[in-house]
Amino acid sequence: KDTTVKSGAKKDPKDSRPKLPQTLSRGWGDQLIWTQTYEEALYRSKTSNRPLMVIHHLDECPHSQALKKVFAEHKEIQKLAEQFVLLNLVYETTDKHLSPDGQYVPRIVFVDPSLTVRADITGRYSNRLYAYEPSDTALLYDNMKKALKLLKTEL
């Protein structure tokens, strides 16, 4: 889904009220620690020397909903996610680096503690490089492991 064109445009009027999540996880892993803003996430990543994983999604997107379920139920991904600073966003940030090839959802972008967006860590779709589908959990897991190999280890 390309959010530049149709972000939230198809919501039923009854659904226009924002749904307040029980936690910042919004269902992506209630046992994990999630940051609230991109700025906070960047700060935590830099100070803790842990990579940042940013998940862009929309509540009313079927592919976001589907990926969320497999992500939350995948034990290995949930375990590995503990080693990241985590942020999931239902809106776009002003940082264009987080949308190297467009503002579609769902997409997952990794950021190094050096605050470099890992544009090299991509999914399997040439037209949407940072998109993942439920069948891509093995690739996502491998990409998370790649992101844990930091660009530059700070002493």
Partner: antibody
Framework: QVQLVQSGSELKKPGASVKVSCKTS????????MNWVRQAPGQGLEWIGW????????NYNGKFKDRFVLSADKSVSTVYLQISSLKAEDTAVYFC?????????????WGQGTLVTVSS | EIVLTQSPATLSLSPGERATLSCKAS??????LSWFQQKPGQAPRTLIY???RLVDGIPARFSGSGSGQDFTLTISSLEPEDFAVYYC?????????FGGGTKVEIK
Amino acid sequence: QVQLVQSGSELKKPGASVKVSCKTSGYVFSRSWMNWVRQAPGQGLEWIGWIYPGDGDTNYNGKFKDRFVLSADKSVSTVYLQISSLKAEDTAVYFCARGGYDGSPWLSYWGQGTLVTVSS
Amino acid sequence: EIVLTQSPATLSLSPGERATLSCKASQDINSYLSWFQQKPGQAPRTLIYRANRLVDGIPARFSGSGSGQDFTLTISSLEPEDFAVYYCLQYDEFPFTFGGGTKVEIK
């Protein structure tokens, strides 16, 4: 093998309610989306909505939001479609259709359909 | 909502001939399109998902192509059991929507 077995035909009066069941087997029930689709006599297909049996999350076609309710019972691997305040125009065959085996949204397996007739 | 337009409404062909069915979306749906076959009194059967992926157990004479807004289902050589109604479905965004169907009938 995957099986979706739906409950039998129903004849109801306008204003009544009906609950159609779809009993599943042959896969992990809680980890595939279940869709409901309807087909009025001689007409095409319409998507009603879907439910994730693992946690009960739902999404409805706005057209079916008011009187249609999807639910799931993990203990018997069954999903349900309940329609209240039935109208003559609800007369249709109702199908359950499982999402992709990996949790993807596409519709893979279909139940045999349940005919609901609403007539006074 | 996204509108899917199928054409032609009816296709009259003989066994052994090639069938080409079209499905056009009112907006870009990436590759999130499925094709179904339905015979009278039966449930639909899924043939293709993600525009071009053949479902297990479906004969190789069925193939799907396209992305964005224009999609095609091709049956390379019609068998007697292929005469039926074919529907496309988009599952890119809610609500999922079906095309109006193409009836493939014996000439």
